[in-house]
Interface confidence: low
């Protein structure tokens, strides 16, 4: 039988009446155009909706936009366009919402051709009021908030000036010219690249990396011959041109650019790229593109300093620079990542790691699924997940994989079951254990979202025809009920729920089309009456994460510790509630070789946990570049995996001796170091 049609499916009683009483329609008095939606703050219920309509005239485009505000999670909206003086808002800049619960919003307006600068509308009270401010420059990018202080804003101008405001956009000061890329670091530090000669494009590879820690009063050049830079976790990365040729290398700093080390990664040529796939304060996943237009590269995982790298995955699918990769952090379970590889026969296969890139494996075939036509053996195959690449290839995949940190273990994704990703219409699969096992959840492509920390999953069929039905499940996708939310079907455009999966409200967005006009419409459904009572202790059960063999004493040990979670029973129909916090009990494991990565100069042969010397380095002194000096490494080949918390057991010895010799890295020499003040 199809998923969800079993006899024992727990039906929610009287749900139609309960949902009908909690379904709120809002028709926007608008021609269709485009619509964008932003949540303002966390748990505030405030939503801003910007509708934009372009009227193409012979010579120019005339635009009109409207701004709406809801303070009840989208049940009711008020037209507040007059607060922004009926100005046309530039949708390419979106709505710049301030960090945390600052309540700050910046909208960038369209201005007429001859004006001296742009115009913004600013609110610091969750969009109840706006202040119009004329800018002394034309913005090139959306305003960037400092993560530490939402009054500090950063913007690049169309003239490549770097502008800073210290009073939430009231006053602006140009702190540097000829800037290509700028980013906020920690402690209100700004990093940016500048060009000396022609332009950002012409000087690529000859840029300088600068830093200011006092909002532009003084500067320090922290790098030269820069191609690009990036921030990830506590790491600052720069790709730097080599002296002798057109290759470039990654340098890394963990002290805001004061000192740099050369990452033990392959150098790349002009047509290749590096990409930080994921980073936290412990480590980084780095993709290094293969030479030639192969569409793949290698994933490396770093040590705790971002310097020594272990090869994690070969033939990792990542199309040309800025292209598509399926790399996905499964946020519902620690250590889990999913991505795609391009196999020798050019088919695309999905791989999963449960230990932060230590080992990769195929996804287990779902119990209730047959192998498709891509499988050589009809009894042996794997699940393959559709993500960004499939979406970019216009396959019938409306959504990327979904997981939420507070919906422990749940992963939802489109996929196919075979030897590789199939171009046939996919189905939707769910895992409730962080990707170890999978079940077909819904037939055919769907939009889906998680509400109430996993207590409810909502889905809408992906169809070219108008729709009026929503599906929901209160048991992690085992059983589904359908609810007709409107008599008149709408052309569906999106499903919106408050980020963080804490809400019980879902908004269905779409438009109605008649002979004369089309209008935006939203339906917000509150599921609070479906989950009538608050969950109690008896509704939760203990679950050991990463458990694969309960008989094994090491069962659940990942990165040196195991975690037991309290999880909602599938049979419990109750509210986790907005204040729900994941309850977990960690316990430390003893160390084994699995808790160590191979040190510089060592590698792990396949299917072996021991690190052995790289043949080409055998008998050589191990020397590597650290903080601009050459270091001598005495090691028996192991280094603790970043974030690994194991204790006792195996403890390989390693020692680093300073050789007091300078590295050959041309990145920064003392004479290039300079400080400047405005």
């Amino acid at each position: 039988s199809a998923p969800g049609e079993d006899e024992e499916c727990g039906r929610v009683r009287d749900f139609v009446a309960k949902l009908a009483n909690n379904t709120h329609q809002h028709v926007f008095d608008d021609l269709r155009g485009s619509v964008s939606l932003s949540w303002v703050g966390d748990s505030t219920g405030v939503i801003l909706v910007l509708t934009t309509f372009h009227v193409p005239l012979v010579i120019m485009t005339f635009g009109q936009s409207k701004l709406y505000r809801s303070e009840d999670y989208g049940k009711n909206f008020k037209d507040i366009t007059d607060l922004i003086n009926n100005t046309f808002i530039r949708t390419e800049f979106g709505m710049a919402i301030g960090p945390e619960n600052s309540g700050k919003v910046v909208l960038t307006a369209e201005v007429s051709g001859g004006s001296r600068g742009g115009r913004i509308f600013r609110s610091s009270d969750f969009a109840k009021n706006f202040v119009q401010t004329d800018l002394p420059f034309h913005p090139l990018t959306q305003m960037m908030y400092s993560p530490q202080n939402s009054d500090y804003l950063l913007a690049l101008s169309t003239e490549n000036g770097l502008w800073v405001s210290k009073n939430f956009g009231g006053k602006w000061e140009e702190i540097h010219k000829a800037v290509c890329l700028a980013k906020w670091g920690s402690d209100n530090t700004i990093f940016f690249t500048t060009y000396a000669n022609g332009s950002c494009k012409a000087d690529l590879g000859a840029l300088e990396l600068w830093r200011t820690s006092d909002l532009g009063k003084s500067f320090k050049t922290i790098g030269v011959k820069i191609y690009s830079f990036g921030l990830g976790g506590r790491f600052l990365f720069a790709s730097v041109m080599a002296d002798k040729d057109t290759t470039r290398r990654i340098h890394v700093s963990t002290d805001q650019g004061d000192t740099w080390s050369m990452a033990q990664l392959p150098s790349v040529g002009q047509e290749q790229f590096y990409s930080i796939l994921a980073a936290n304060d412990d480590m980084v996943f780095m993709h290094v593109d293969e030479p030639g237009d192969t569409g793949f590269g290698t994933i490396f995982t770093s040590d705790d300093r971002g310097i020594v790298y272990s090869k994690s995955l070969d033939r990792h699918l990542y199309t040309t620079t800025g292209g598509e990769t399926d790399f996905t952090n499964v946020t519902s379970l620690r250590g889990v990542y999913i991505t795609s590889v391009l196999s020798e026969d050019n088919s695309i296969q999905t791989m999963i790691t449960f230990d932060q890139g230590g080992r990769w494996t195929h996804l287990r075939k779902p119990e209730n699924s047959e192998c498709d036509a891509t499988a050589k053996n009809k009894n042996e195959c794997s699940l393959h997940i559709h993500a960004s690449y499939s979406i970019s290839q216009k396959l019938n995949v409306p959504m990327a994989p979904l997981s939420e940190p507070n919906a422990v273990g749940i992963v939802i994704a489109h996929g196919s079951v075979g030897d590789a990703i199939s171009v046939m219409v996919p189905d939707v699969y769910i895992s409730d254990d962080g990707g170890y096992s999978w079940t077909k959840m819904l037939e055919g492509p769907h939009y889906y979202t998680i509400l109430d920390a996993g207590g409810i999953i909502v889905a809408i069929e992906h169809s070219s025809r108008p729709i009026n039905v929503i599906k929901f499940s209160t048991d992690e996708g085992q059983c589904w009920q359908t609810y007709t939310f409107t008599r008149d079907p709408i052309y569906f455009t999106g499903l919106a729920s408050e980020p963080g999966a804490r809400s019980m409200n879902i908004s269905i967005w779409g438009f109605t089309e008649s002979f004369l006009t089309s209008q935006w419409v939203s339906y917000t459904i509150d599921f609070k009456d479906i989950l009538e009572r608050n969950c109690e202790e008896k509704d939760y059960t203990i679950w050991l994460a990463h458990s694969t063999d309960p008989e094994d004493y090491e069962d659940g040990c990942i990165l040196g510790y195991k975690e037991q979670f309290l999880r909602l029973r599938k049979s419990s129909v109750c509210q986790n509630g907005r204040d729900y916090v994941v309850t977990k009990q960690p316990s430390i494991c003893l160390c084994s070789l699995e808790d160590f990565l191979c040190d510089f100069g060592y590698y792990r042969p396949e299917n072996d946990s021991k690190c052995v010397e790289q043949p080409e380095l055998k008998g050589h002194d191990l020397e590597f570049c650290l903080y601009g000096r050459e270091e001598h490494l005495t090691t028996n080949g192991y280094r603790k995996i970043p974030g690994d918390k194991c204790q006792g057991g195996v403890n390989p010895v390693r020692e680093v001796k300073d050789l007091k010799k300078k590295c050959t890295s041309n990145f920064l020499s003392p004479e290039k170091q300079n400080s400047k003040s405005n």
């Epitope: 004493y553 316990s587 494991c589 070789l593 160590f596 006792g648 195996v650 403890n651």
Partner: antibody, heavy 129, light 107 residues
Framework: QVQLVQSGAEVKKPGASVKVSCKAS????????MSWVRQAPGQGLEWMGI????????SYAQKFQGRVTMTRDTSTSTVYMELSSLRSEDTAVYYC??????????????????????WGQGTTVTVSS | EIVMTQSPATLSVSPGERATLSCRAS??????LAWYQQKPGQAPRLLIY???TRATGIPARFSGSGSGTEFTLTISSLQSEDFAVYYC?????????FGGGTKVEIK
Amino acid sequence: QVQLVQSGAEVKKPGASVKVSCKASGYTFTSRYMSWVRQAPGQGLEWMGIINPVGGSTSYAQKFQGRVTMTRDTSTSTVYMELSSLRSEDTAVYYCARDPSGIAAAGPASRYYYGMDVWGQGTTVTVSS
Amino acid sequence: EIVMTQSPATLSVSPGERATLSCRASQSVSSNLAWYQQKPGQAPRLLIYGASTRATGIPARFSGSGSGTEFTLTISSLQSEDFAVYYCQQARLGPWTFGGGTKVEIK
């Protein structure tokens, strides 16, 4: 020979802090973890936490979390245990003990416990008003 | 955390006799268990590690056995210097935990 020498006895008032040192000699300091164990008068042994001398990473028993800090100084091969917000029930003998870590990882990926094989002589901490 | 329970709390044995001490874990600790001896006014001393391996310099009359949740320390023929308190300790999962101790006294 391998030995751990701890600092002398301390008398402290409630609410104060105490910092006990443990100097290691006779082996490579960074090759073994160090645990701290305490024993109240007439009571059993109670594990407080562990420190890895290589990176200084620590793990504390939940009971002492927020009150205990373990540090190390590799230049003097010394580990320290500081306990703050002292109460009368913290009156005990505090021991440092060289913790397992096994042999250097040459063997298979075994998870084998070698026991706390070397102990300090103990430091008596008395908390009294 | 894993709770270690030792029995009996006190064991009265005559010199030359056999003493059997028991230690039970609330969940499996595999063979990650150690036994210690402590005499009044002294620091504990490691006797057995890995549940059954004698530490350096420990006489053959001390032996350990067991795996999982049930462990035994046996002293085949008690000598006068063996009268002391004995503790078991697990290192399977942090936090490390000790049993409450068994006091072996002269009968």
